[in-house]
């Protein structure tokens, strides 16, 4: 139903606390450089305005769209041009163009210092002084670094953060209580951010159909007992919610997400028995619980897929009459039977099936043409299975750090034009997938690996789009969302790349490396490794092993020496010469 005042309607639905949090997230995601105090001032102004509209929905400006109200607020900031440059040009546009313009200025990689965690004592002091302000600061710091973070989920993590502090700030050993809790929240929140970013990229770059297909596959795996019609209903609502959040309409998104959770709880009998434990929880926890829900057991006695999708003489007729419904049904039926497959695999299989029907249904005897379709789709299953098996074997053999090094070499050979820090960052991220997934049972390994890789490659693609350096990366990123991972896997040494001239600076180390934390030490060594590959992209595995071995021995020797700097100064050039000889 239409409301006289949209902002009053959302204020009433969400309540003041969540309303203020979402307004703060909205502002922080769009105005990533502004200080916290400025945002707090604007949040209070917007909240006061919303309260006035609740009191009188006919009051001046209360009938305006929320996006317009936000745009007007932003455009009224006096320092907008000097702080944000050309973002201020958006203010000359009319909505909805102005909204689109703001969206295009969101920065996925803002030049902000890492979000450092203060010492537990300092944390607790600040929290006790003013816990609302403290949690507001958390929302602000996360939102400005993650401009597409799923806003209602961020409210959930802020609640978790608040609960951890409430409990641990009373503990005798605050650090022992807080550290594991905050580490767990951080790790989960980072994954949540990456997942939402992929959803937004899917909608923005590949369209609604791509996102809906992704959702059908995921929900069919989670709720295999639900009918296709029920899955379709949820997917339609979920698409609306996701579009709203990706578009920056966070109040609408959070409200509609609440509605979706309510709908699912009211219809849990026809969706999943696992919903019971979620539906008794309060709003934020309920929606989060549904998002993270364990998959339901498969219904027994499911007929063979071939019955409806190969043997049935009506396949082409059904395909012609309602292509998307028929393919959606195929994806649903396939996904609910295969919870162990990744979303990417399921979508590639559905795409393969669609391509086969496109070809066969145009023939005089379609059935003869598509009769062996499932045999022909088998490579789409075998390829990722084999890849995961090989990579997990390598991970088990080398450990996380060694596996990251192998990936650093592999990805530098694939895209040597990419900057060294970026290659190291992605090699490390890709390597950590081994830690996350390789220890899992066989049935979960495949989906874990490919689903995580999709998140990492999406981030790579987003940053590469901002400053493109490699045509091959652009091609893999833009041609097809579901084929990104296979596309990157299929890249080998870039034959067009002209090796980088040798710079001794890239391989010169000083005593300060000895005192660095282990992680930073690894990063320094991996930077040198990447530089080495850029210098000799076709070096053999044996040559690389030798050089890395010499390098590790050099670092150990000099870091153990009494006069470390002298050792680095004297032995460094010798090591460089030896490496050059090995790689010659």
């Amino acid at each position: 139903e239409a409301h006289k005042s949209e902002i009053a309607h959302r204020f009433n639905d969400l309540g003041e606390g969540h309303f203020k949090g979402l307004v703060l997230i909205t502002l922080s995601q769009h105005l990533q450089k502004s200080p916290f105090e400025e945002h707090v001032k604007l949040v209070n102004e917007v909240t006061d305005f919303a309260k006035a509209c609740v009191a009188d929905e006919s009051a001046q400006n209360c009938g305006k769209a929320i996006a317009t109200l936000f745009g007007d607020k932003v455009c009224a900031i006096p320092s907008l041009r000097e702080t944000y440059g050309e973002l201020a040009d958006c203010c000359a546009k009319e909505d909805p163009d102005r909204v689109e313009c703001f969206l295009q200025h969101k920065d996925d990689n803002p030049n902000l210092p890492p979000f450092e965690r203060p010492e537990p004592e300092a944390l607790c002091t600040a929290f006790k002084e003013n816990n609302d302000r403290f949690i507001g600061h958390y929302l602000y710091e996360v939102s400005r670094r993650h401009p597409y973070f799923y806003a209602p989920e961020l409210l959930y993590y802020a609640e978790k953060y608040k609960n951890a502090l409430t409990e641990c700030c009373e503990a005798a050993d605050k650090a022992a209580c807080l550290t594991p809790k905050l580490d767990a929240i951080k790790e989960k929140a980072l994954v949540s951010s990456a997942q939402q970013r992929l959803k937004c990229a899917s909608l923005q770059k590949f369209g609604e159909r791509a996102f809906k297909a992704w959702s059908v596959a995921r929900l069919s795996q989670k709720f295999p007992k639900a009918e296709f019609a029920e899955i379709s209903t949820i997917v339609t609502s979920l698409t609306k919610v996701t579009k709203e959040c990706c578009h920056g309409d966070l109040l609408e998104c959070a409200d509609d997400r609440q509605e979706l959770a309510k709908y699912m709880c009211e219809h849990q009998d026809s969706i999943s028995s696992k919903l019971k434990e979620c539906c008794v929880k309060p709003t934020l926890q309920k929606a989060h619980c549904i998002l993270e829900i364990q998959r339901d057991e498969l219904p027994t006695e499911l007929p063979d897929l071939a019955v409806d999708f190969v043997e049935d003489k009506e396949v082409c007729k059904n395909f012609a009459e309602a292509k998307d419904v028929f393919l959606g049904t195929f994806l649903y039926e396939y996904s609910r039977r295969h919870p162990e497959y990744s979303i990417g695999m399921l979508l590639r299989i559905a795409k393969g099936y669609e391509a086969k029907l496109e070809k066969c249904c145009a023939e005089a005897d379609p059935h003869a043409c598509y009769a062996k379709v499932f045999d022909e789709l088998q490579p789409l299953i075998d390829e990722p299975k084999k890849l995961v098996q090989q990579n997990c074997e390598l991970f088990d053999k080398l450990g996380e750090y060694g596996f990251q090094n192998a990936l650093a070499v592999r990805y530098t050979q694939k895209a040597p034009q990419v900057s060294t820090p970026t290659l190291v960052e992605y090699a490390r991220k890709l390597g950590s997938v081994g830690t996350k997934c390789c220890s899992l049972p066989e049935t979960e390994r495949l989906s874990c690996t490919e689903n995580y890789l999709a998140l990492i490659l999406n981030r790579l693609c987003i940053l590469h789009e901002k400053t493109p350096v490699s045509e091959r990366v652009t091609k893999c990123c833009t041609e097809s969302l579901v084929n990104r991972r296979p596309c990157f896997s299929a890249l080998h040494v870039d034959e067009t790349y002209v090796p980088k001239p040798f710079h001794a600076d890239s391989f010169t180390f000083h005593a300060d490396i000895c005192t660095l934390p282990e992680k930073e030490k690894q990063v320094k060594k991996q930077m040198a490794l990447v530089e080495l590959v850029k210098h000799k992209p076709k070096a053999s595995e044996e040559q690389m092993k030798t050089v890395m071995g010499d390098f590790a021995a050099f670092l150990k020797k000099c870091c153990d020496a009494d006069n470390k700097e002298a050792c680095f100064t004297e032995d460094g050039p010798k090591l460089v010469a030896k490496c050059q000889a090995t790689l010659a």
Epitope: K313, K317, A320, C361, A362, E363, A364, D365, P366, H367
Partner: nanobody
């Protein structure tokens, strides 16, 4: 919505000819092979003939081979069945279908061959 409208049926004497048409709409006609099926009074559906989307490939049931010719006009999104040397056993309701489907979508057109 997909629509298939058959026409051209009638009553003819054995040995005579008829040309059936099927006007198709609501789907990408050129992307689909099309078929003719028929149903004699009191019998099940029987496949008669099929043609590929481009019109280059055709298939016929043994009972009509050499007598019937299937064709299509993709510009007009219309399917045809030219029936020569008709026999009493060709008496049936004729339906055009998408792909190799053996179900009726349109209303069909009745062909009666009798002396």
């Amino acid at each position: 919505d997909v629509q298939l409208v058959e026409s051209g049926g009638g009553v003819v004497q054995p040995g005579n000819s008829l040309r059936l048409s099927c006007a198709a709409s609501g789907f990408t006609f050129t992307s689909f092979g099309m078929s003719w099926v028929r149903q004699a009074p009191g019998k099940g559906l029987e496949w008669v003939s099929s043609i590929s989307g481009s019109g280059s490939d055709t298939l016929y049931a043994d009972s009509v081979k050499g007598r019937f010719t299937i064709s299509r006009d993709n510009a007009k999104t219309t399917l045809y069945l030219q029936m020569n040397s008709l026999r009493p056993e060709d008496t049936a309701a004729y339906y055009c279908t998408i792909g190799g489907s053996l179900s009726r979508s349109g209303q069909g057109t009745l062909v009666t061959v009798s002396s």
